[in-house]
């Protein structure tokens, strides 16, 4: 268990042209606040449960009113840190989202409105217990400067907060197999409660309830020796059962060096050889210059010769973000067909298909007519996930099983009488009307609204509607 701490140093206009307008005015004073979301792993858009590592909302900052005509300065910030407690192990690699919100203090109905000024995201490597790491992120014309660290809550220690420390029981030394807790030299590493039955000599655990075997031992409880050849280790307490030297825990076990650093033992402790761009006792510090390699995924870093000057990452195709940390949203290519909803889960694309469609990209139009018969000569028409029958003349209903009454809809206008006929319906028009549905009035002089009556039919005669 531990706490991730975020300290916002400044939020204001970034370098370069196009300085943003001040977000507050005399008519509409406002104040800023921040929210951070943390997720384990590499992708800030990963599809875990929301903010799986935790989230925090800052206090509101001081009320700010723009001075007329003045450019937007760095805006007044809330006091204090944003703290995100984490219950389990610190993952070492994490993704963050920091939102900068403005709360408007004008006369709004239902309370002040919120406006999202900037949203930055990235992924970082960080060992718990190390010093503050500094960062600069840009969002549009705004620039956010901040520091962050992860620290363990006692009794947890270590780069992942998985080791536990307890006060020494004896004044001079720790118990067998237990090391002093650097930097708390007056405390000893406490054994975790491992899986029941886990061999106290040959097994250990880094998480409660597990049983991991020392070299040369195997089995679910680490009670089975692998072979005598594994007894040649130069270090460790002697095993009472076999006479083998079983490796005891050493300072480099679990590699305390973060960010790809390599560990070597020294007489008193360990030493990390850090890759370019990282430094510190455990290679956990990054000062965010181009020398530190802040651009992910092969991005090219330009400028930023010292920690206080800005750098720019030129991203390779397929990546974006101020540190090239964001994969281009593959959903923007609209891969889901037939109106499917695209979800970019980070590790995969998923399409949620509309009814009637299926397949990884909703490319398959489900055969709604499969196994469905339309009676009485009807033909099946598919679409939208539901089959429909186009019925032969004289039939209706979902499956064309019902004999249709063509007169049910009262198709004959102006009081005409309807007669069902084998080929449809026939309207017998009231005096003064004619047409297939009696829709045309006959004019008093004998002319009708039709150009001419069809040959062989007088106005008033029944007209067959074909």
């Amino acid at each position: 268990a531990g706490v991730f701490e975020l300290q916002i140093h400044s939020f204001g206009p970034g370098p370069g042209p196009g300085a943003p307008r001040s977000p507050c005015s005399a008519r509409l004073p406002c104040r800023l606040f921040f929210r951070v979301c943390l997720k384990p792993g590499l992708s800030e858009e990963a599809a875990e449960s929301p903010c799986a590592l935790g989230a925090a909302l800052s206090a509101r900052g001081p009320v700010y009113t723009e001075q007329p005509g003045a450019p937007a300065p760095d805006l007044p910030l809330p006091d204090g840190l944003l703290q995100v407690p984490f219950r389990d192990a610190w993952p070492g690699t994490f993704s963050f989202i920091i939102e900068t919100w403005r709360e408007e203090l004008g006369d709004q109905i239902g309370g002040p409105a919120w406006s999202l000024l900037a949203r930055v995201a990235g992924r970082r490597r960080l060992a718990a217990g190390g010093p503050w790491a500094r960062d600069i992120q840009r969002a549009g014309a705004w620039e956010l400067r901040f520091s962050y660290r992860a620290r363990c809550e006692p009794p947890a220690v270590g780069t992942a907060c998985t080791r536990l420390c307890r006060p020494r029981s004896a004044p001079s030394r720790c118990g067998p197999g237990l090391r002093p807790c650097a930097p708390l030299e007056d405390e000893c590493e406490a054994p975790l409660v491992c899986r029941a039955g886990c061999s106290p000599e040959h097994g250990f655990c880094e998480q409660p309830g597990e049983c991991r075997c020392l070299e040369g031992w195997t089995g679910p409880l680490c009670t089975v020796p692998v072979s005598t050849s594994s007894c040649l280790s130069p270090r460790g307490p002697s095993s009472a059962t076999t006479g083998c030297l079983v490796p005891g825990p050493g300072p480099c076990d679990g590699n305390p060096c973060a960010n790809g650093g390599s560990c070597s033992e020294t007489p008193r402790s360990f030493e990390c050889t850090c890759p370019r761009g990282f430094y510190g006792l455990r290679c956990e510090v990054s000062g965010v210059t181009c020398a530190d390699g802040p651009c992910f995924n092969g991005g090219l870093c330009v400028g930023g010769a010292d920690p206080d000057s800005a750098y720019i990452c030129h991203c390779p195709p397929g990546f974006q973000g101020s540190n090239c940390e964001k994969r281009v949203d593959r959903c923007s290519l609209q891969p889901c067909r037939n109106g499917g909803l695209c979800l970019d889960l980070g590790h995969a694309l998923r399409c949620r298909c509309r009814a009637g469609f299926a397949g990884p990209r909703c490319e398959h139009d489900l055969d709604d007519c499969a196994g469905r018969a339309c009676a009485n000569g009807g033909t099946c028409v598919e679409g939208g996930g539901a089959h429909r029958c186009s019925c032969a003349l004289g039939f209706g209903g979902r499956d064309c099983r019902e004999r249709a009454d063509p007169c049910a809809a009262r198709p004959c206008a102006h009081g005409g009488r309807c007669y069902a006929h084998f080929s449809g319906l026939v309207c017998a028009c009231a005096p003064g009307y004619m047409g297939a549905r009696c829709e045309f009035p006959v004019h008093p002089d004998g002319a009708s609204a039709l150009p001419a009556a069809p040959p062989g039919l007088r106005p008033g005669d029944p007209q067959r509607y074909l």
């Epitope: 929210r35 979301c37 858009e45 599809a47 903010c51 919100w101 709004q108 239902g110 949203r119």
Partner: nanobody, 127 residues
Framework: EVDLVESGGGLVQPGGSLRLSCAAS????????MVWFRQAPGQEREFVGG????????AYTDSVKGRFTFSRDNAKNTGYLQMNSLRPDDTAVYYC????????????????????WGHGTQVTVSS
């Protein structure tokens, strides 16, 4: 399970107005943040704004300030996006999304934080 259905999209001239609706079925919508995202061709899905879960207050992205307003009718389980002074760069598919998170403060601006989504409605601003 909450089903969301957007409506009200269409073609409108620059400077015109549209009102989008998001009808929720399945649960009481008042317990959810109900927000709008939009996605233009070749772009990421972008937060537009909406109403928070706990007190219904409006939240919006800075680029739509003064032009778009968000409201909800809890009795009808429906959220609304009133879009005025529309510009060609507002052209996109507009999606409604809902979730019970976060329990306080403004709604999240990140698509991955939302469990429930509609299928979207196309808004085209063109002369």
């Amino acid at each position: 399970e909450v089903d969301l259905v957007e409506s009200g999209g269409g073609l409108v001239q620059p400077g015109g107005s549209l009102r989008l609706s998001c009808a929720a079925s399945g649960r009481t919508a008042s317990r959810y943040s109900m927000v709008w995202f939009r996605q233009a061709p070749g772009q990421e899905r972008e937060f537009v704004g909406g109403n928070s879960a706990h007190d219904g207050r409006s939240a919006y992205t800075d680029s739509v300030k003064g032009r778009f307003t968000f409201s909800r009718d809890n009795a009808k389980n429906t959220g609304y996006l009133q879009m005025n002074s529309l510009r060609p760069d507002d052209t996109a598919v507009y999606y409604c999304a809902a979730d019970t998170n976060p329990p306080y403060g403004p709604p999240w601006s990140t698509p991955s934080e939302y469990e429930y989504w509609g299928h979207g409605t196309q808004v085209t601003v063109s002369s």
